[in-house]
C-alpha cells in the first residue's frame, strides 16, 4: 500500500506522457489522477516506466474500479497486464476479439500464463461459446491451445468452429479429446467430396470409431502411416487385411517398420497369419493356419 | 458535429469494378471499427466488411465477400471499398457504418451511396 | 457465420398497443446483440445494444431483453412515428459476426 502524501506543486499531470518516467513513486500516487491514467491507458505502453512504477499505475487502477476494469481500459493495458492476477482478471468482463489480441500479443513467445488462461476463460464466457474467430485466435498464438482444453471444455466447441482448425493445432491431444473432436469435424466436413472431406477429417481420425474407418477403406484414401499410427487401438482392430490393405494403399508397406508398435502389433495378432502373407510384407505373430478364433468380448455381451 | 459520408456509387456495367469511400469529419478515427453494410431494394441489411482502425488494423469479412471484396483505409479520415466482378446482384445501397473500439455496436451511419450495377 | 432469425414479419398494432419482435441467434451469443430501426429512405438508428441497454436518447418504451440465443424487442405504448422495420445484429467483433443481421421485421401501425 503506498502511502497517501500531497502532490508537489507544478507536478500535477494533464496527461501521461514521458515526463513522468522521472516521477518517484510516490508522486506517480499523488500526481496522476485514476480517471486521466483510465482514459489514456494507450499511452502507457508507449512510455518506459519501471515495474516499481508500473505497480503503482495498476494500484491507482484498481482503486478506481475495485469490481473489475472496464474492457476500454482492458484493451489498452499493454505490458500492465503482466502485473495482473488472475484474480484481478476473473473480475472482468472480456468480450473484444481485438481486447483478447492485443493481451494475447504482450504475452507472445511466452508459455500460456495462468493469467492468459483466466482471460481466455473469461473472453469465452463473455462470448457465450468458443467460437470460430476466437479458435482462429488462440491457435495462433497457441497452436496446442486446443489440446489443453477438457475434453468436457471441448464439448462446448461449436462444429463450426473445427474449420479453424490446423493439423497442427491437433498435434499434443490425447484419445479422449479426439473423442470428442472427431464427431464435430465428421459434422463440419460432412458436405465435402470424398478426397477433400479425407484431407480435412485426417488430422481428427485419432477419435474415428471402426465403422468409419471401413467406410474410409472403401473410398481410396492411401492413408499415411504416421496417420494410421495415431488411430485408436480399438478401432483399428476389428479391421480384416484386406480393410487395412485399401486404407493404407501403397503405404501399406509401411507396417513392417511399424510392426512391434501399437496399434500396428495388437492387431497382427488378431488377423490370421494366411491373410497376413498375403501381403507379401512378412508380417509375423498372427494366429496359425487352423487355431479357432473365439471372441471374448462377445461371449461376455451374451453371459 | 460527428459525420459520415459515403461517395463513389453510380452506375456501373456487369464485371466491372468500383471504389466506394468513406468519409469522417469531426471524429476521432483512432479507435474504432469502420464497417460496410449494403441493402438491396426492398431488402434486409447485409454486413460486408470491417477494419479496425488503429492498433491491429485486422480486417473481417463476412464468409460471401472474401476475395471481391476489399476494404481499407485509405487515410486519417477515409476508409474505402474495392468492389470487382460486379454483378446485378451487388445492385444496393451501400453503408458506411462506425461501431465503437469493441464490437460491432453501429451508433453512427453515412446516409449510403447507391450503387446500380445493369448493361 | 452466425445466423440471426427474425418472427414475425409484417407485425401490426394499434396506436397505443404493443408489439413484440423475437431474435434468434444460431449459437449462444450471450447479450452481444443490438436492434435497430429503419425508416425508408434512412440509415439505420440504434435502439438498444447489448441485448437490454436503450441507447441515449430513444424512448424508454422500447425494450430489448434475452440472452444466449432468445432475444426480444417489445414496444408499447405504440405510436404512428414507430412504424419502421427492426433489425436485430450480433454485435461482437470477428468474421463470424461482420454479416449477422436479422432479416428484419416490419412494424405496421394501425
Known amino acids: 500500500e503506498v502511502e497517501k502524501t500531497a502532490c508537489p506543486s507544478g507536478k500535477k499531470a494533464r496527461e501521461i506522457d514521458e515526463s513522468l518516467i522521472f516521477y518517484k513513486k510516490w508522486e506517480l500516487e499523488a500526481c496522476v489522477d485514476a480517471a486521466l491514467l483510465a482514459t489514456q491507458m494507450d499511452r502507457v505502453n508507449a512510455i518506459p516506466f519501471t515495474y516499481e512504477q508500473l505497480d503503482v499505475l495498476k494500484h491507482k487502477l484498481d482503486e478506481l474500479y475495485p469490481q473489475g476494469y472496464p474492457e476500454s481500459v482492458i484493451q489498452h493495458l499493454g505490458y500492465l497486464f503482466l502485473k495482473m492476477s488472475p484474480e484481478d482478471i476473473r473480475k472482468w468482463n472480456v468480450t473484444s476479439l481485438e481486447t483478447l489480441k492485443a493481451l494475447l500479443e504482450v504475452n507472445k513467445g511466452h508459455e500460456m500464463s495462468p493469467q492468459v488462461a483466466t482471460l481466455i476463460d473469461r473472453f469465452v464466457k463473455g462470448r457465450g461459446q468458443l467460437d470460430k474467430d476466437t479458435l482462429d485466435t488462440l491457435t495462433a498464438f497457441y497452436p496446442g491451445y486446443l489440446c489443453s482444453l477438457s475434453p468436457e471444455e471441448l464439448s462446448s466447441v461449436p462444429p463450426s468452429s473445427i474449420w479453424a482448425v490446423r493439423p497442427q493445432d491437433l498435434d499434443t491431444c490425447d484419445p479422449r479429446q479426439l473423442d470428442v473432436l472427431y464427431p464435430k469435424a465428421r459434422l463440419a466436413f460432412q458436405n465435402m467430396n470424398g478426397s477433400e472431406y479425407f484431407v480435412k477429417i485426417q488430422s481428427f481420425l485419432g477419435g474415428a470409431p471402426t465403422e468409419d474407418l471401413k467406410a474410409l477403406s472403401q473410398q481410396n484414401v492411401s492413408m499415411d502411416l504416421a496417420t494410421f499410427m495415431k488411430l485408436r487401438t480399438d478401432a483399428v482392430l476389428p479391421l480384416t487385411v484386406a480393410e487395412v490393405q485399401k486404407l493404407l494403399g501403397p503405404h501399406v508397406e509401411g507396417l513392417k517398420a511399424e510392426e512391434r508398435h501399437r496399434p500396428v502389433r495388437d492387431w497382427i495378432l488378431r488377423q490370421r497369419q494366411d491373410d497376413l502373407d498375403t501381403l507379401g510384407l512378412g508380417l509375423q505373430g498372427g494366429i496359425p493356419n487352423g487355431y479357432l478364433v473365439l471372441d471374448l468380448s462377445m461371449q461376455e455381451a451374451l453371459s | 458535429q460527428e459525420q459520415l459520408v459515403e461517395s463513389g456509387g453510380g452506375l456501373v456495367q456487369p464485371g466491372a469494378s468500383l471504389t466506394l469511400t468513406c468519409t469522417a469529419s469531426?471524429?476521432?478515427?483512432?479507435?474504432?471499427?469502420m464497417c460496410w453494410v449494403r441493402q438491396a431494394p426492398g431488402k434486409g441489411l447485409e454486413g460486408i466488411a470491417c477494419?479496425?482502425?488503429?492498433?491491429?488494423?485486422?480486417t473481417y469479412y463476412a464468409s460471401w465477400a472474401k476475395g471481391r471484396f476489399t476494404i481499407s483505409k485509405a487515410s486519417s479520415t477515409t476508409v474505402t471499398l474495392q468492389m470487382t466482378s460486379l454483378t446485378a446482384a451487388d445492385t444496393a445501397t451501400y453503408f458506411c457504418?462506425?461501431?465503437?473500439?469493441?464490437?460491432?455496436?453501429?451508433?453512427?451511419w453515412g446516409p449510403g451511396t447507391l450503387v446500380t450495377v445493369s448493361s | 457465420d452466425v445466423v440471426m432469425t427474425q418472427t414475425p414479419s409484417p407485425v401490426s398494432a394499434a396506436v397505443g398497443g404493443t408489439v413484440t419482435i423475437k431474435c434468434q441467434a444460431s449459437?449462444?451469443?450471450?447479450?452481444?446483440l443490438a436492434w435497430y430501426q429503419q425508416k425508408p429512405g434512412q440509415p439505420p438508428r440504434l435502439l438498444i445494444y447489448?441485448?437490454?441497454n436503450l441507447e441515449s436518447g430513444v424512448p424508454s418504451r422500447f425494450k430489448g431483453s434475452g440472452s444466449g440465443t432468445e432475444f426480444t424487442l417489445t414496444i408499447s405504448d405504440l405510436e404512428c412515428d414507430d412504424a419502421a422495420t427492426y433489425y436485430c445484429?450480433?454485435?461482437?467483433?470477428?468474421?463470424?459476426?461482420?454479416?449477422?443481421f436479422g432479416g428484419g421485421t416490419e412494424v405496421v401501425v394501425k
Open positions: 457504418a462506425r461501431g465503437t473500439n469493441l464490437n460491432y455496436i453501429f451508433r453512427l
Open positions: 469531426g471524429i476521432d478515427f483512432s479507435r474504432y471499427y
Open positions: 477494419i479496425y482502425i488503429g492498433g491491429s488494423g485486422s
Open positions: 449459437q449462444s451469443i450471450n447479450n452481444g
Open positions: 447489448s441485448a437490454s
Open positions: 445484429q450480433c454485435i461482437w467483433d470477428g468474421n463470424s459476426y461482420v454479416n449477422a
